[in-house]
């Protein structure tokens, strides 16, 4: 039950996280005009990964896409790449994790397969979250560097009558959305990995031993409270009672860490 809850919660948290990563990637407010010295401005600039915009005091907003690929800063390209990789991995992770959910029955899929899929999706979520956090952090670092550079330029006057006041940019809402979303995806991935451990605990498997009784022959297959580890196909987790005794060869299909004859 706890395993199912952990897996389900991990899936939901990751789903929210990936939705957040997609939202952050699409948002225009990765960087916004710094209004520290001038809280009321006639022209408010903000920029995203794909386009830059201006909101005028008139209420009109106009955006302009970055129609060049080669002319863009390498850092921006890197951030785009990180975010896209994060989204792609997250999307694949979500797809895998849907089939891995314990509460969803798909044909005769073994719990062992579900455990493996849970682990795979968990790792994908972790990498996806790290990609998003890395992308946002790289962009934030770029902003901080540019902020101080433009601040320095702002106070080294032009000498003449004409001033060129550089627009300084600070952190936009998308950065915070990205950090939170990346963190959630990461947490969701960790939860999926924990759930996988619950689905596949380290345990001792006993080789089936045949007991020959005077009446009915009973073959006892150990497995007690095992969920499923990929080591056996007894998915119902109950003792197998058979009319006749099994040969040792027949039971050999259940390998275990320690063989007791």
């Amino acid at each position: 039950m706890a395993v199912t809850a952990c897996q389900g919660l991990g899936f939901v948290v990751s789903l929210i996280g990936i939705a957040g990563i997609i939202a952050a990637t699409c948002m225009d407010q990765w960087s916004t005009q710094d209004l520290y010295n001038n809280p009321v401005t006639a022209v408010f600039n903000y920029q995203g990964l794909w386009r830059s915009c201006v909101r005028e005091s008139s209420g009109f907003t106009e955006c302009r896409g970055y129609f060049t690929l080669l002319g863009l800063p390498a850092m921006l390209q890197a951030v785009r790449a990180l975010m896209i990789v994060g989204i792609v991995l997250g999307a694949i992770g979500l797809l895998v994790s849907i089939f891995a959910l314990k509460c969803i029955r798909i044909g005769s899929m073994e719990d062992s397969a579900k455990a493996n899929m849970t682990l795979t999706s968990g790792i994908m979520f972790i990498v996806s979250g790290l990609c998003a956090i890395a992308g946002v952090s790289v962009f934030a670092n770029m902003l901080v560097t540019n902020f101080w550079m433009s601040t320095a330029n702002m106070y080294t006057g032009m000498g003449g009558m004409v001033q060129t006041v550089q627009t300084r940019y600070t952190f936009g809402a998308a950065l915070f959305v990205g950090w939170v979303a990346g963190g959630l995806t990461l947490i969701g991935g960790v939860m999926m990995c924990i759930a996988c451990r619950g689905l596949a605990p380290e345990e001792t498997n006993y080789k089936a031993v045949s007991y020959h009784a005077s009446g009915h022959s009973v073959a006892y297959k150990p497995g007690g409270f095992k969920a499923s580890t990929g080591f056996g196909s007894n998915t119902k987790n109950k003792k197998i009672y058979d009319g006749g005794a099994r040969t040792e060869d027949e039971v050999q299909s259940y390998p275990s860490k320690h063989d007791y004859v």
Epitope: V43, F44, S52, V54, E56, S58, E62, Q163, T167
Partner: antibody, heavy 118, light 113 residues
Framework: QVQLVQSGAEVKKPGASVKVSCKAS????????VNWVRQAPGQGLEWIGM????????RLNQQFKDKATLTVDTSTSTVYMELSSLRSEDTAVYYC???????????WGQGTLVTVSS | DIVMTQSPDSLAVSLGERATINCLSS????????????LTWYQQKPGQPPKLLIY???TRDSGVPDRFTGSGSGVDFTLTISSVQAEDVAVYYC?????????FGQGTKLEIK
């Protein structure tokens, strides 16, 4: 068609107050900011401030912060500008104008001449 | 505040001739977000309110004849009337729409020679 109709000319004594109105029609009143600009006789244009009819949000030129008060009556689609503590140098034609894209003023009222004279 | 300086103060041209009015801003009017210049040109005839001619430095308002052309970027802007007509006699103003307070140039008076 878009129209901004201003109130008639006013003659006031120094120290008095005057309230100039600007009635808008022909467009969605609450969607556009309305500006006020003044022009002293034979002089250039001077921006006073602007008001947004939907929330009565204002932007005022600091030179006029103690002089002009901008208000809105959405029920009549009218913008008001009250000028206080009038002095002779406040004698001017006062225009209201709608703010358009590019922070440009696309439609103007006919102007209201305010004369301050003792 | 941004200071807008127009030149010349007055200009006399013959009918059909080209007229050029310059406007210099004390600060760049270029918005980095959309690469637009927030400069507007107005025409004011005697006894009338100003009329919008050009916004965003080069975008003609609807109904404005194509003989009026705006150009320039950053701090230096020009209004050109390619072939002056009698009805173009007016005072022309440039305006900063980039930052508060919005400021106007002192005006350039266009007359017919």
């Amino acid at each position: 068609q878009v129209q901004l109709v201003q109130s008639g000319a006013e003659v006031k004594k120094p120290g008095a107050s005057v309230k100039v109105s600007c009635k808008a029609s022909g467009y969605s009143f609450t969607n556009y900011w309305v500006n006020w600009v003044r022009q002293a006789p034979g002089q250039g244009l001077e921006w006073i401030g602007m008001v947004h009819p939907s929330g009565s949000e204002t932007r005022l030129n600091q030179q006029f912060k103690d002089k002009a008060t901008l208000t809105v009556d959405t029920s009549t689609s009218t913008v008001y500008m009250e000028l206080s503590s009038l002095r002779s140098e406040d004698t001017a034609v006062y225009y209201c104008a709608r703010v358009w894209s590019g922070n440009a003023f696309d439609y103007w009222g006919q102007g209201t001449l305010v004369t301050v004279s003792s | 505040d941004i200071v807008m300086t127009q030149s010349p103060d007055s200009l006399a041209v013959s009918l059909g001739e080209r007229a050029t009015i310059n406007c210099l801003s004390s600060q760049s009017l270029l918005a980095s977000g959309n690469q637009r210049n927030y400069l507007t040109w107005y025409q004011q005839k005697p006894g009338q309110p100003p009329k919008l001619l050009i916004y965003w430095a080069s975008t003609r308002d609807s109904g404005v004849p194509d003989r009026f052309t705006g150009s320039g970027s950053g701090v230096d802007f020009t209004l050109t009337i390619s072939s002056v007509q009698a009805e173009d006699v007016a005072v022309y103003y440039c305006q900063n729409g980039f930052s508060f307070p919005f400021t106007f140039g002192q005006g350039t008076k266009l007359e017919i020679k």
